[in-house]
């Protein structure tokens, strides 16, 4: 059986280095694929009800996710 | 919006083996995390594991290699063979796609597998 | 494994209630200041929804009765006035760690 890539990280890996235009971070393998590959967030409507999700750097900081809310390039998710 | 949709299921014997399958439609399963979750009657939740858009495939290791995930992108569909069946694994099994965050916010109906002689 | 319980495994309540169900991990699953905990309603016979993920993120289409907090071990999904559809089994579920675990659930019922 395959084990998953987050077997082979420790607690404390070092965040990636963020991702070039075009490409988004995945959560999961902790690397940069292209943006097509992931179901990157869409933004919320304005006025929406639901509080905007949290993300751990300001949006100035997240880099390549193309329109609305931005992939996060960081190691952290699954 | 994503659509699952899953079939396969039934009644098989101890030690036979089956294969289920979950069609999606609204987005290619070229693209995020697709899983596969079960519960048993009257009981919780467990995750089974998942197939990617590479088509890199993780498992719950409770499952002991006996469970193989595998899809067909021509047919948007992926699948979960499972073999060396036991009593235990009668439940609903579940397709479910993940959002970015993780969290799994498409489900399908849900198909049931019996493992009886 | 991160073991996940929930309290109470059930409990009576009726429309209009403040419901406050807790989810304990048996380690933490924040890292880099994320929490991975989310939450799922499910109705008997039916398919889990999602409700809250990331702790406290409110899925889309979720009312805003339903809210989550917490952080590293100890998480609520706090429903604000319960109302008669939301009589259902609530389960909570970490992707911090593989595998990925669940809470084993809290059905909440009609007093």
């Known amino acids: 059986m395959r084990r998953g890539p987050r077997s082979l990280r420790g607690r404390d890996a070092p965040a990636p280095t963020p991702c070039v235009p075009a490409e988004c971070f995945d959560l999961l393998v902790r690397h940069c694929v292209a943006c097509g590959l992931l179901r990157t967030p869409r933004p919320k409507p304005a006025g929406a009800s639901s509080p905007a999700p949290r993300t751990a750097l300001q949006p100035q900081e997240s880099v390549g996710a193309g329109a609305g809310e931005a992939a996060l390039p960081l190691p952290g998710l699954l | 919006e994503v659509q699952l949709v899953e079939s396969g299921g039934g009644l098989v014997q101890p030690g036979g083996s089956l294969r289920l399958s979950c069609a999606a439609s609204?987005?290619?399963?070229?693209?995020?995390?697709w899983n596969w979750v079960r519960q048993a009657p009257g009981k919780g939740l467990e995750w089974v594991g998942y197939?990617?858009?590479?088509?890199?495939?993780y498992y719950n290791p409770s499952l002991k290699s006996r469970f193989t995930i595998s899809r067909d992108t021509s047919k948007n569909t992926f699948y979960l063979q499972m073999n060396s069946l036991r009593a235990e694994d009668t439940a609903v099994y579940y397709c479910?796609?993940?959002?970015?965050?993780?969290?799994?916010?498409?489900w399908g109906q849900g198909t049931l597998v019996t493992v009886s002689s | 494994d991160i073991q996940m319980t929930q309290s109470p495994s059930s409990l009576s309540a009726s429309v209009g209630d403040r419901v406050t169900i807790t989810c304990r991990a048996s380690?933490?699953?924040?890292?880099?200041?994320?929490?991975?905990m989310h939450w799922y309603q499910q109705k008997p016979g039916k398919a889990p929804k999602l409700l809250i993920y990331?702790?406290?993120d409110l899925e889309s289409g979720v009312p805003s009765r339903f809210s989550g907090s917490g952080s590293g071990t100890d998480f609520t999904l706090t429903i604000s006035s319960l109302q008669p559809e939301d009589f259902a089994t609530y389960y909570c579920?970490?992707?911090?760690?593989?595998?990925?675990?669940f809470g084993q659930g809290t059905k909440v019922e009609i007093k």
């Open positions: 579920q970490q992707t911090s760690k593989d595998p990925w675990t």
């Open positions: 609204g987005d290619s399963i070229t693209r995020g995390y």
């Open positions: 990331r702790a406290s």
């Open positions: 380690e933490s699953v924040d890292d880099y200041g994320i929490s991975f």
């Open positions: 197939i990617n858009y590479s088509g890199t495939t």
């Open positions: 479910a796609n993940l959002n970015y965050y993780g969290a799994m916010d498409y």
